[in-house]
Interface confidence: low
Amino acid sequence: GCLTQLYENAFFRGGDVASMYTPNAQYCQMRCTFHPRCLLFSFLPASSINDMEKRFGCFLKDSVTGTLPKVHRTGAVSGHSLKQCGHQISACHRDIYKGVDMRGVNFNVSKVSSVEECQKRCTSNIRCQFFSYATQTFHKAEYRNNCLLKYSPGGTPTAIKVLSNVESGFSLKPCALSEIGCHMNIFQHLAFSDVDVARVLTPDAFVCRTICTYHPNCLFFTFYTNVWKIESQRNVCLLKTSESGTPSSSTPQENTISGYSLLTCKRTLPEPCHSKIYPGVDFGGEELNVTFVKGVNVCQETCTKMIRCQFFTYSLLPEDCKEEKCKCFLRLSMDGSPTRIAYGTQGSSGYSLRLCNTGDNSVCTTKTSTRIVGGTNSSWGEWPWQVSLQVKLTAQRHLCGGSLIGHQWVLTAAHCFDGLPLQDVWRIYSGILNLSDITKDTPFSQIKEIIIHQNYKVSEGNHDIALIKLQAPLNYTEFQKPICLPSKGDTSTIYTNCWVTGWGFSKEKGEIQNILQKVNIPLVTNEECQKRYQDYKITQRMVCAGYKEGGKDACKGDSGGPLVCKHNGMWRLVGITSWGEGCARREQPGVYTKVAEYMDWILEKTQSSDGKAQMQSPA
């Protein structure tokens, strides 16, 4: 299953399959997730080791048993691949690293005014993988405001150095934020020239294209079909690149198919997995296990559940079957692709779905009347769980925020439904940033059921929590995916990086904002909060957040929206925007429903009709 816990001060011994430099443990974990053999990783931050060569070292590891011995190493961080973790699987990495220089091939330098602009340039440059930006205070004036666009053979820095007044980060192309746009066309009977960066075997050009999309240096590809004239080259997928970023030439060639990486697509990327099953095809590879199952779909499920399995063949040969069950061969290889593809067989083959980010139909948890005042604009995909709850009577308007917590579930505040309990009048918009982008053609979700907490009373602040079951499940994308919930009664975690988001008023007597706003707000103890609200009871089922001096807060229209905190690289839904005295007033923090205190209720209500819990734990 999905394991998300990180082990501090621990290093996995042995099992190395690859190593690289990464700026933090989360990026290392992402590289592990996308590496075909990696199950475990260990990361050495700069502070953890004196050996200059190993600083920022990310060590990817495999193990037949799924685990390795952990040794104590101060400062080291270890953890698991996120294969099988559904919506948490993403190659998108937005963080900016201050005081760090990520080294690589500097192929472009320009002057820009901010690190965000530099990241945008990288994202809009076809060859850029990562970048470094020298700030206004950099000690060499001629380098100040320099934006260096970079690439490397493996897509990760060739070295990482601690360096004052330099900021680094990665291209946001894997976040589907590139302005370049992509070529969806597949060109039949055409072969591209230029440099081959890798060679794999694939059953068709579409798998070849997906592999190209997620390969750090592949910009385009040529696939040789199973009837290509040279037998040894059949089903070969050649991943290619060029200096210019486009093929310098193409040759008409029977039984070849060419196309482009889809990494530069805007708003939608292919899933990093291959779900199609290929009848009459055998995939060869290293044998992991053989099991008897009923049907090829069960064989694929079995492969997906066995984390080391990369692909499978379901044999229908009489000698491989007994009763209704036949042999399911679970296989793997060094590069995640079959080592041999045979046609005209009595088997059916396919791939593990361990990297599909749709996951199962679940809510994400972890084991371990009020807008944003003083906030700033959010960017696409920054808060993909944020939804807008709108009411359509005669006109249509935004009333509340909410948080997507599963394919079919939204968590919000109960008071949003005060006087509007009819599910038919509500429209739920997800995967949006600007309210002005909503037109009559914009897809929305309708409500199947509104579940208001049984102890909630109108005009009272207590138990201000409600669940919405959507009529149809939503697919997950980079712009629309759930937020993880905290563990039950989570009181030990100290959250220091918390944000509130919403389209609500930017001042007490204001108006709904067009662009989703975000504000970084510190949590306040309940004791401190109670002092500020002597006429109200601040219960243990509430959490408060705000600045003593005011100036930043949620406000009208943000109600029901998320208070999220980042801990160990993972965002969790800590609170639901509930109430407060005015907005952003001095010494009047915002009050939020404490989600951890309602985990039993959420679990109970999100159980499916067959009684199976709709909760999945990544930990």
């Epitope: 004196n50 220089d101 004036a141 001629e142 150095k161 360096l163 004052s164």
Partner: antibody, heavy 124, light 107 residues
Framework: EVQLLESGGGLVQPGGSLRLSCAAS????????MTWVRQAPGKGLEWVSG????????IYADSVKGRFTISRDNSKNTLYLQMNSLRAEDTAVYYC?????????????????WGQGTMVTVSS | DIQMTQSPSSVSASVGDRVTINCRAS??????LAWYQQKPGKAPNLLIY???SLQTGAPSRFSGSGSGTDFTLTISSLQPEDFGTYVC?????????FGLGTKVEVR
């Protein structure tokens, strides 16, 4: 032999000016950033100013900003420090030093070659 | 500015002794630290750069260690010519700053 030789120090009244020079020999002067460091009598070392190899970039400690000007003449292999509006607290031995980049990017600095120093006394 | 604090301010030792000098930065400076030896009336002389790398020409009895905020210069076997003041310097961020020095006297 790699060498730096300072000159131009002496006694000057408060508010006065002085120009220090540092002659470099034994290495390709134009490839190196240079710096001035001073040491008041009985006190510790204090970084004063730095200049990039081309002379295009200059940096100063807050204590001398607006009063001191660092410059260089690569054709003469010489580094300069023009000191105006001198104060009693500027009294020190002034060293010029070569900036050694031990990190290949040229971003992290240590001072590997030093001159013998020249004494500047500001007193009425 | 980053403050560099050295301890002890002076140390008296005999020839052949192992001498340890400490330097603490007021904030994390990674490994951007240099050590210099300075004799009375003379200019400083670079011994160690990048916290632990020995400068060409410096005797191998000198070694540096540490990372972050705490650093150490060690003289494994003190020699008569090792008397003088040892100064640490950070090159992590401007302005470059020096410690006040540790005076090593030969007993």
């Amino acid at each position: 032999e790699v060498q730096l030789l300072e000159s131009g120090g002496g006694l000057v009244q408060p508010g006065g000016s002085l120009r220090l020079s540092c002659a470099a020999s034994g290495f390709t002067f134009s490839l190196y950033d240079m710096t001035w460091v001073r040491q008041a009598p009985g006190k510790g070392l204090e970084w004063v100013s730095g200049i990039s190899s081309s002379g295009g970039v200059t940096i100063y400690a807050d204590s001398v900003k607006g009063r001191f000007t660092i410059s260089r003449d690569n054709s003469k292999n010489t580094l300069y420090l023009q000191m105006n509006s001198l104060r009693a607290e500027d009294t020190a031995v002034y060293y010029c030093a070569r900036t050694y980049y031990y990190d290949s990017s040229g971003y992290a600095d240590a001072f590997d070659i030093w001159g013998q120093g020249t004494m500047v006394t500001v007193s009425s | 500015d980053i403050q560099m604090t050295q301890s002890p301010s002076s140390v008296s030792a005999s020839v052949g002794d192992r001498v340890t000098i400490n330097c603490r930065a007021s904030q994390d400076i990674s490994n951007w630290l240099a050590w210099y030896q300075q004799k009375p009336g003379k200019a400083p002389n670079l011994l160690i750069y990048a916290a632990s790398s020995l400068q060409t020409g410096a005797p191998s009895r000198f070694s540096g260690s540490g990372s972050g905020t705490d650093f150490t210069l060690t003289i494994s076997s003190l020699q008569p010519e090792d008397f003088g003041t040892y100064v640490c310097q950070q090159s992590y961020s401007l302005p470059w700053t020096f410690g006040l020095g540790t005076k090593v006297e030969v007993r």
